[in-house]
Amino acid sequence: AGVFELQIHSFGPGPGPGAPRSPCSARGPCRLFFRVCLKPGLSEEAAESPCALGAALSARGPVYTEQPEAPAPDLPLPNGLLQVPFRDAWPGTFSLIIETWREELGDQIGGPAWSLLARVTRRRRLAAGGPWARDIQRAGAWELRFSYRARCELPAVGTACTRLCRPRSAPSRCGPGLRPCAPLEDECEAPPVCRAGCSLEHGFCEQPGECRCLEGWTGPLCMVPVSTSSCLGLRGPSSTTTGCLVPGPGPCDGNPCANGGSCSETPGSFECTCPRGFYGLRCEVSGVTCADGPCFNGGLCVGGADPDSAYICHCPPGFQGSNCEKRVDRCSLQPCRNGGLCLDLGHALRCRCRAGFAGPRCEHDLDDCAGRACANGGTCVEGGGAHRCSCALGFGGRNCRERADPCAARPCAHGGRCYAHFSGLVCACAPGYMGARCEFPVHPDGVSALPAAPPGLRPGDPQRAGVIAVIVVVVIAIVAGIVVLVISRKKRMAKYEKAEIKEMGEMHRELNA
């Protein structure tokens, strides 16, 4: 038994152009948290196996808000170690999966939203009881720096935590450098001494004299990075400074294949051969299985028919994404009809209906012809189980509640200015024109004869008296109609207002819960 410990040192944009400035989306601040998954073995099958050695989730980090114009810093991280206890022997070789998750804290109604920002998968060798191993990994445009170690918990000891150690009654009998320990016996033994000079950081030993290198390191003392230990197989002109061949540019330079995929060049492009459990153009899709618990927010995980096929998360209402990590903006589907206000309460949707409408989606129009639903002098026309309003001049919309803009079509000719009135419109004509729509040019001798009269209503205009009469009659009719409509509407709406008040009270309780 023992504990695997992971310490995240930094997470931030990687070097080079195109690095992201912020982990947060445009919707506002966010914070990070990490998930670690451990799988035994270094075999290619490891990708499909569950987190058999265990998994852990970090606390949420401090809230991060991007500062405009400021350089993108390393992001604030959660405090403390991620610890993954293991019950059985430490395997020595294992796969380490670290996921960086983003929790968005913007104006999401009903709580934060989660999304997977980066995932690194690395196969490693590590002896329990050894020193911290440091690592730097890139995941897309992000860079993650971390350290990890495995340590045994007494009475287990050794590089695999398989030997049991129990204190002697007289431990002083053990000499310097020896400890009271043995497989189920009381005797002293020395811990294995690695090869002299073996790197504390990149090497370890399970037997005396060994210097076994962690992945990526080589040499008798594990001091040489694998990438620099050989210059074979590279293309291009020879370098006089190192004696190595310097590679020319090629589609596989920098190895675009993720997760241990191998790159092979094709004409003008590249092809990745992925290890089992990874797929995609760049092997970027991980063969995580349901055993890894990949579905968030109560999503139901269903495994594929064969080991190579991916899991599927069936998300509960309100969540979407391959891991159910995204909260659905269900209001974006505009479920509330007739101008109703949509509220996503997380477990349910509510529509706040405009006056005159009701129902779960505001689909019921309370104004039918029986209730004289057409406002502003409009007349109700029934038909086909519905109704429509034939609106009076100057009004429009479903119930004639919207003031129509008769000037929208620019009816006044020759630069005349349009004014909307209850009766329709009036044109104020430019100098030199007259008529209801300023369509008639004025004779030159009449231009200065009537300067004081309002434009468009000139003394010589034969329509003047008719227009004034029409306006007076229409205004009187409209005022009378409005009075009748208001009285009848007050009676009819009283009962619905009670229901509205009751519904709003329920909604407030749900939002506060």
């Epitope: 090869r195 002299a196 037997q207 005396p208």
Partner: antibody
Framework: QVQLQQSGTELMKPGASVKLSCKAT????????IEWVKQRPGHGLEWIGE????????QYNEKFKGKATFTADPSSNTAYMQLSSLTTEDSAIYYC????????????WGQGTTLTVSS | DVQITQSPSYLAASPGETITINCRAS??????LAWYQEKPGKTNKLLIY???TLHSGIPSRFSGSGSGTDFTLTISSLEPEDFAIYYC?????????FGGGTKLELK
Amino acid sequence: QVQLQQSGTELMKPGASVKLSCKATGYTFTGNWIEWVKQRPGHGLEWIGEILPGTGSTQYNEKFKGKATFTADPSSNTAYMQLSSLTTEDSAIYYCARWGSTVVAYDYWGQGTTLTVSS
Amino acid sequence: DVQITQSPSYLAASPGETITINCRASKSISKYLAWYQEKPGKTNKLLIYSGSTLHSGIPSRFSGSGSGTDFTLTISSLEPEDFAIYYCQQHNEYPLTFGGGTKLELK
């Protein structure tokens, strides 16, 4: 004290094989690498490879793969190097040495075995 | 492979003098270079390891310096028993390689 005692001079025919020995005393044999080094006049010292007796782990110089084979017998504290398909190029002094317990180098050497390959 | 160039190949000096022998690696080997002394009829002797660490039992007139690619063995105030062949060896990466040797002769 630590000592590495090597087998005596060998005179071999081309095409034959020979097994050189290196007996260790004065320390725990299994915990230190035994190194093998070739010395020819005008060629200086050449590292052939190494073996960790406790585990049998070996490392070879690519140049000597197929030529040299290392084994170790912890019961007799003896390391062996077998050289196969001998040619006159294999004529040399062969040394065994110990990689130190606390010293990052060869802290003890054998006296050397002279191999002569001649028809 | 890491090539080790040792110079000079021959060096004549007198007792009491100070001499230096150089080894240059074809690429960085950090500090992992050792110096050995070879004398007829005796087993090879480790003098310096990790570039500059004096092995136990070796007189303090022997000293080593350098890291990366350039290393130096200095013997100050030569004694008669110091006339021998000296080799350097890198043990940073496989295959381990030796310098060509320097024969220190009595002038």
